[in-house]
Amino acid sequence: KDTTVKSGAKKDPKDSRPKLPQTLSRGWGDQLIWTQTYEEALYRSKTSNRPLMVIHHLDECPHSQALKKVFAEHKEIQKLAEQFVLLNLVYETTDKHLSPDGQYVPRIVFVDPSLTVRADITGRYSNRLYAYEPSDTALLYDNMKKALKLLKTEL
């Protein structure tokens, strides 16, 4: 889904009833610690020397919904995610580095503590480099491990 074309229909009130108390996780992992803004996430990443994982998604996108479920239910991904600064966004930031090849959802971009966007860590789709589908959990897990191997930091 390309959010530059259409940002999704209004959320149906019937679909909006929270099953659990609403948290910053938005269903991507209620046991994980999520940051609220990109600025906060960058600060936390830099000061804690942990990579940042940014998930762009939309409530009204079937593929965002589907990826969210497998992400939240994947025990290994959830465990590995504890080593990241985490941010999920339902809106686009002004930082164009977070959309190297377009503003589609869902997409997952990693940022190094040196505040370098890891454009080299991509999914399997050549037309949407940072897209992942439910069948791509093994690749996403591998990419998370890649992101944990930090770029050389300045002394």
Epitope: V5, A9, G27, C61, P62, K69, E73, R128, P134
Partner: antibody, heavy 120, light 107 residues
Framework: QVQLLESGGGLVKPGGSLRLSCATS????????MNWIRQAPGQGLEWIGW????????NYNGKVKDRFTLSADKAKNSVYLQMNSLRAEDTAVYFC?????????????WGQGTLVTVSS | EIVLTQSPDFQSVTPKEKVTITCKAS??????LSWFQQKPDQSPKTLIY???RLVDGVPSRFSGSGSGQDFTLTINSLEAEDAATYYC?????????FGGGTKVEIK
């Protein structure tokens, strides 16, 4: 193997209600999206909505969202379509169809359908 | 909502002939398109998903192609058992929508 079995169809008067069931077996029920689709006599297919049985998340076609409600019972491996304020134009065969085995949105497997007739 | 336009509506084909059915979306749907086969008084059967991926157990004479707005279902060397109505479905965006169907008849 995967099995989906719809039931609960029948004749109902305009304004009436009906609850359809889709009993499933042969796969991990809670981890695949379940869709409902209908087909009016001699017509094409229309998507009604989907539910994720793991947590009950739903999304509906705007044409029916005020009258139709999806639910799931993990203990019974079944999903339900509650239809209220039925109209003649709701007359159709109603199918449940499972999403991809890996949690993907594509429709992988269909039940045989149950006929709902709305008539006075 | 996204509109899918299928063509032709009807096709009469001799066995072993090649059949091509097209599905055009009213907007870009990436590769999120499926094809279904429905025989009279039966439920639909999924043939293809993600535009070109063949479902397990579906004969290799069926294939799908396309991305963006234009998609094609091809049946190479049609067999008598392939007489059916074929539907496309987009699952890129809610509500999911189907094409109007293409009825394939054996001459």
């Amino acid at each position: 193997q995967v099995q989906l079995l719809e039931s609960g169809g029948g004749l109902v008067k305009p304004g009436g209600s009906l609850r359809l069931s889709c009993a499933t077996s042969g796969y991990v029920f809670s981890r695949s999206w379940m869709n409902w689709i209908r087909q009016a006599p001699g017509q094409g297919l229309e998507w009604i909505g989907w539910i994720y049985p793991g947590d009950g998340d739903t999304n509906y076609n705007g044409k029916v969202k005020d009258r139709f409600t999806l639910s799931a019972d993990k203990a019974k491996n079944s999903v339900y379509l509650q239809m209220n304020s039925l109209r003649a134009e709701d007359t159709a065969v109603y199918f449940c169809a499972r999403g991809g085995y890996d949690g993907s949105p594509w429709l992988s497997y269909w039940g045989q359908g149950t006929l709902v007739t709305v008539s006075s | 909502e996204i509109v899918l336009t299928q063509s032709p509506d009807f096709q009469s084909v001799t066995p072993k002939e090649k059949v091509t059915i097209t599905c055009k979306a009213s907007q870009d749907i990436n590769s999120y398109l499926s094809w279904f086969q429905q025989k009279p008084d039966q439920s639909p059967k999924t043939l293809i998903y993600r535009a070109n991926r063949l479902v397990d157990g579906v004969p290799s004479r069926f294939s799908g192609s396309g991305s963006g707005q234009d998609f094609t279902l091809t049946i190479n060397s049609l067999e008598a058992e392939d007489a059916a109505t074929y539907y496309c479905l987009q699952y890129d965006e809610f509500p999911f929508t189907f094409g109007g169907g293409t009825k394939v008849e054996i001459k």
